[in-house]
């Protein structure tokens, strides 16, 4: 049976100040080092304990870094991406993509490119709300009888 995984993809701008031991995270990826299949993007592989990124708290292992100080990280060699971070200066602005796994289910797997991959809670929340409203209306109706 195929497991279905839905992801909630969010983007965030994270501004880090380089600490005494730098930015405090490792990266994988690049056109010459694809870490995620069919994706040459740059991903966070490790966050150093007590480093700048860890103390800030927003950057997570597995996050995709889209840009550094406004410079796109698409189609970069791995070492070129590393050099970009190392030369980014004291104040570093990161555009980051977080992927939050929402639900596993027994339905066929759907790729992230499929526009019909709606996170399950976006369906469940309105249904739950409607159920609660209907229950409340029914109880009020019974009280009036």
């Amino acid at each position: 049976m195929n497991g279905r995984v839905d992801y909630l993809v969010t983007e965030e701008e994270i501004n880090l100040t380089r600490g005494p031991s730098g930015l405090g995270f490792n990266i994988v990826g690049g056109t010459d080092q694809q870490y995620v299949s069919n994706d040459s993007g740059i991903y966070v592989s490790r966050i150093k304990e007590n480093g700048a990124a860890a103390l800030d708290g927003r950057l997570q292992e597995g996050d995709k870094i889209l840009s550094v100080n406004g410079q796109d990280l698409k189609n970069l060699l791995h070492q070129d991406a590393v050099d970009l971070f190392r030369n980014a200066g004291y104040a570093v602005s990161l555009r980051v993509q977080h992927r939050l796994q929402v639900q596993n289910g027994p339905i066929g797997h759907r790729g992230e490119g499929d526009p019909s991959g709606i996170p399950i809670f976006m369906v469940l929340v309105p249904v739950f709300a409607l159920t609660m409203v209907a229950a409340w209306a029914f109880m009020r109706y019974r009280q009036q009888l």
């Epitope: 031991s21 730098g22 490792n26 010459d32 080092q33 592989s45 150093k48 304990e49 791995h78 070492q79």
Partner: nanobody, 127 residues
Framework: QVQLVESGGGLVQAGGSLRLSCAAS????????MGWFHQAPGKECEFVAE????????GYADSVKGRFTISRDNAKNTVYLQMNSLKPEDTAVYYC?????????????????????WGQGTQVTVS
């Protein structure tokens, strides 16, 4: 998960050379930054050298620059430390270490906290 096994240590006279090897298990060896550290008796574990996953970037402690050379063979899952012009103060246990990905910080800041996987060490004694 990576397992590391060092070899090549031994006793050598001052001015001599040794080549340490570190064999790693694991399928994605080229995604790991590899490093060498050493620990002399009664001292802390200190950074010696590191090399990026593709081998395109290396970094060294000031004390070994020009004498030691780190290299790797990704086809053999092995990293090497060529040590020339050895000095008595190079005497220590040498540890191979690995971490997934490339640090975004230069090796000037490197410490043992930057690495997750460690070998058991090999003794180097310079008389």
């Amino acid at each position: 998960q990576v397992q590391l096994v060092e070899s090549g240590g031994g006793l050598v006279q001052a001015g001599g050379s040794l080549r340490l090897s570190c064999a790693a298990s694991g399928r994605t060896f080229s995604s790991y930054t590899m490093g060498w550290f050493h620990q002399a008796p009664g001292k802390e574990c200190e950074f010696v050298a590191e090399i990026s996953g593709t081998g395109g970037n290396t970094g060294y402690a000031d004390s070994v620059k020009g004498r030691f050379t780190i290299s790797r063979d990704n086809a053999k899952n092995t990293v090497y430390l060529q040590m020339n012009s050895l000095k008595p103060e190079d005497t220590a246990v040498y540890y191979c270490a690995a971490v997934i990905g490339s640090p975004t910080d230069s090796s000037d800041y490197r410490s043992s906290l930057d690495y997750d996987y460690w070998g058991q060490g090999t003794q180097v004694t310079v008389s």
